[in-house]
Structures are given as C-alpha cells and as structure tokens.
C-alpha cells in the first residue's frame, strides 16, 4: 500500500520516490517525507535554508507528538515553552520563564516565588527551627574549672531552611551568663568545652546547675525538664557532702 | 490527473439529512486522506472532516454530533452525511485530496456543489 | 481553534504591480500554512504550500514567504488572470482553518 500512495503520487509530484527512506511512507527528492509509516511522527527538519520532511518514532525537544487518525505530526510547543506534554502543559519552560501548572510565567503568582534552579514557581518556605536543646556546662576560656563567673551556650538546629522569600531563621545559639562555685583544675584535667567533655558526677564545689548572674545575657522560661534537673543536682550535692563527712571521720 | 466530482440534492429541508457523494478518478481511495469543506455563502470556508486511506475518519468538534464520512471502495467513492441541517447549513460543498503533511495540501479539488437548506 | 487573520480583505492592483497579502495566525503554526486562489464559480487552486513551495504548474511570479505566527503571499509582477480570491489555510493541527480571503482585482 504504501509503494502505491507513492506510485499515484508520482502523477501529482513527478519527483516522487517509490523507494523512500526509513520511516517515509511517500516521499521526494526535493520534500522528503511527505507522508510517514503508521505510528511515526511527520516534522519538517530546517537543514540549512531548507525544510525537509522526516518521519521520526518521538518528537524532538520543543515539540509534541499530535495523533490525528491515520496522519500523526509533531507539533510546537509554545513558543515560551522548550519541552511540552501537549500544546496546553508545558514541562520545562525557555530562559527567563518560569514553570507554573503546565504555564510558563514572567512573574510567579501571589503566594509564589520563582525558583531560579528549577525555573519554577514553588510555595514560600519559611524557617523551622528545633525547640532548644538544653544549655551547656558553665565554661570560661574553653575551661570548666578555675573560675567562678563563665558562660552558657545552648543551641537549636535548622529543620527547615527558609525559600528566597521566606521568614528568615531566628537565631540558633543563645549565650547567658553563669555563677558556679569555684573549682580547683586538677592536674591534666584539659576541662573541656560542652557535650565532647565526659559528663560525670559533679566534683565537690562543682556545680552542674547553672546560677545565671544577674547580669546574664537572655534567660529563658524554665522548662519541667530544666526544673527536674535542678532538683537532681541539688540532691547531688546534698549526698557529696555527707559522703565527705563520712569519709574524713575514718581518715582519723 | 486526479480528479473528484461532488454530488447529490441541491436543496434539503431543516431538520432533515445531507447527503452528498465524492466520486474519485485518477487515484484510488485506498490512499490518501479525503476530505470535505464547505462555504458559507459569504465566502468564509470551514473544514469538515476526511476520511483516510485506511478508512478512519475525523470531524470537527464543531459537527461531530452531526456528521458521518464514510466510504465504498469498490466504486471508488467517499460519502457526507449531516444530520439535522438548518438554513446556517447552507454552502458550497466541496470534495478535496491531500497525501502527506509534506506535500500540497488539498491538491485537488471537487469543483464544488451548492446545498440550500429551506423549507 | 487557531484563527488566521488575513489583511487586506480586498484590493485594486494595477497590472505589472507587486502585490502582497499577508495571513497571521494566532499562534505559531510552523510553516504548516498553504495559500490558494477562487475565481468565481470555479473551484479552488492551491498554488503554495508549507508556507513556500509552489505547486506543480504555477507560475513563478507567486511566492511565499514567513514563520511563526506571519505569512505572506506576493504575486511579483500581476497579470489579469490573477484577479479572484485568495486564501490561506493552516494545517498545523486539526481542525484545519481558512483565512476570510483577499478580494484582488485589476485597477
């Protein structure tokens, strides 16, 4: 059948070939393709100043595949649009458009701001942060012996990191400052600085809860955590100092 | 050279069918795409549909509901019907031919019937 | 559906002149656009299609030219059996549509 649309063509375009290339189903020296095999898509290609007929199994970027009974064809996408599903859904738009429901946009919409990685019109993202995690060892110097007024840090991490137009994060460490009873260095002790030093039993003179001076930067509502550690720690200290008293009466 | 001859009744009365019959010489139906186009009487043209080598058809949304292009092969012809006309069904009615997005579009053509829809 | 507006809707040309009709579509229709003459009761010649090419047997004088969404006819030099209507028709996708025509007669 198709050696014969060729053949009657040959009346109409005596140029046309019988024997045509692959995919063609009628074809010219001059045009080309001028009709395609069943399920294969007709689209000019420019080569030079010269438009030729092929026939092609999918559409080239910029176009889309059209289905039309018996006579299939790529079509254009618009012409805002590089890469498109049909002529009405876009999936990647041309440079300085950006992509919005199947829609390339100069300016995203109300609500929306352009992702210039995507060329995409996203939600607004603001910043997340984690609630605080609890505040560090009083240290002074990066020491948390020799000294009786230091400081206290404690931080938050980033959950979410805010869109071009999103809320910007808060701050995500905090520094107060803090009282503890003075407490001799010992020999080697490095007493190092937060969660890389050994959490132990506070020494005697050692105090794990934090007394902020009255001075301190920014204190917080105390949590029931924060409150049920401080309780623990002054019962701590209420039991190193009887086990001391203990300790010296044998000593004599 | 390929040649298509229009006919049927020149006038129908609303409500009824138009029919009209596209007999084709120089070229069998059984390749190709076969069509038909009207126009109205102040010279505005309106594609209506064809039918292919194969026997598949398409029609304009605008008349889908209304039109059937069918075809018989043994006598080399093709076939309009339009359901339920209205005098806006009036028009020259035309048979046309192309092969290809390639080639020339409508190559040939019928030389046309007039068709008035009146009571 | 894609509209073709063609411009002028009629003209007089004295004969020998460089005439030009033109066709915009409403969207780009990628060279899929064909150019044919009506004279009166008879049918109509296709003379141009994809968007340059002449048909078989037409003579030389009549050209296309265009891209995207702007096409035009010239016809170099008229001669008096070129007065009638001419048409442009895209067939970028289905349904195909016609332009409203150019009336051209001869000064």
């Known amino acids: 059948q198709n050696a014969s649309r060729g053949r009657r063509q040959r009346r109409m375009h005596p140029n046309v070939s019988q024997g045509c290339q692959g995919g063609c189903a009628t074809c010219s020296d001059y045009n080309g393709c001028l009709s395609c095999k069943p399920r294969l898509f007709f689209v000019l290609e420019r080569i030079g100043m010269k438009q030729i007929g092929v026939c092609l199994s999918s559409c080239p970027s910029g176009y889309y595949g059209t289905r039309y009974p018996d006579i299939n064809k790529c079509t254009k996408c618009k012409a805002d649009c590089d890469t498109c599903f049909n002529k009405n859904f876009c999936t990647k738009c041309k440079s300085g458009f950006y992509l919005h429901l199947g829609k390339c946009l100069d300016n995203c919409p109300e609500g929306l701001e352009a992702n210039n990685h995507t060329m995409e019109c996203v939600n607004i993202v603001h910043c997340e942060v984690s609630e605080w995690n609890p505040w560090s060892p009083c240290t002074k110097k990066g020491k948390t012996c020799g000294f009786k007024r230091g400081t206290e840090t404690r931080v938050r991490e980033i959950m979410q990191h805010p869109s071009a137009k999103g809320n910007l994060c808060p701050p995500t460490n905090e520094t107060r400052k803090c009282t503890v009873q003075r407490k001799k260095c010992q020999k080697g002790e490095r007493g190092k600085k937060g969660r890389e030093r050994k959490r132990k039993k506070p020494n005697k003179g050692e105090s794990k809860e934090a007394i902020p001076d009255s001075k301190g930067l920014e204190s917080s509502k105390e949590t029931p955590e924060q409150r049920e550690n401080k309780q623990q720690q002054k019962k701590r200290k209420v039991q190193d100092k009887q086990q001391k008293s203990v300790s010296v009466s044998t000593v004599h | 050279e390929v040649q298509l001859q229009e006919s049927g009744p020149s006038l129908v009365k609303p409500s009824q069918t138009l029919s009209l019959t596209c007999s084709v010489t120089g070229d069998s139906i059984t390749s190709g795409y076969w069509n038909w186009i009207r126009k109205f009487p102040g010279n505005k043209f309106e594609y209506m549909g064809y039918i292919s080598y194969s026997g598949k058809t398409y029609q304009n949304p605008s008349l889908k509901s209304r039109i059937s292009i069918t075809r018989d092969t043994s006598k080399n012809q093709y076939h309009l019907q339009l359901n339920s006309v209205t005098t806006e069904d009036t028009a020259t009615y035309y048979c046309?031919?192309?092969?290809?997005?390639?080639?020339?579009?409508?190559?040939?053509w019928g030389q046309g019937t007039l068709v008035t829809v009146s009571a | 559906d894609i509209v073709l507006t063609q411009s002028p809707s009629s003209m007089y040309a004295s004969l020998g002149e460089r005439v030009t009709i033109t066709c915009k579509a409403s969207?780009?229709?990628?060279?899929?656009l064909s150019w044919f003459q009506q004279k009166p009761g008879k049918s109509p010649k296709t003379l141009i299609y994809?968007?340059?090419r002449l048909v078989d047997g037409v003579p030389s004088r009549f050209s296309g030219s265009g891209s995207g969404q702007d096409y035009s006819l010239t016809i170099s030099s008229l001669e008096y059996e070129d007065m009638g209507i001419y048409y442009c028709l895209h067939y970028d996708e289905f349904p195909l549509t016609f332009g409203a025509g150019t009336k051209l007669e001869i000064k």
């Open positions: 046309a031919t192309y092969y290809g997005y390639g080639g020339p579009w409508f190559a040939y």
């Open positions: 994809l968007t340059n």
């Open positions: 969207q780009d229709i990628d060279s899929y």
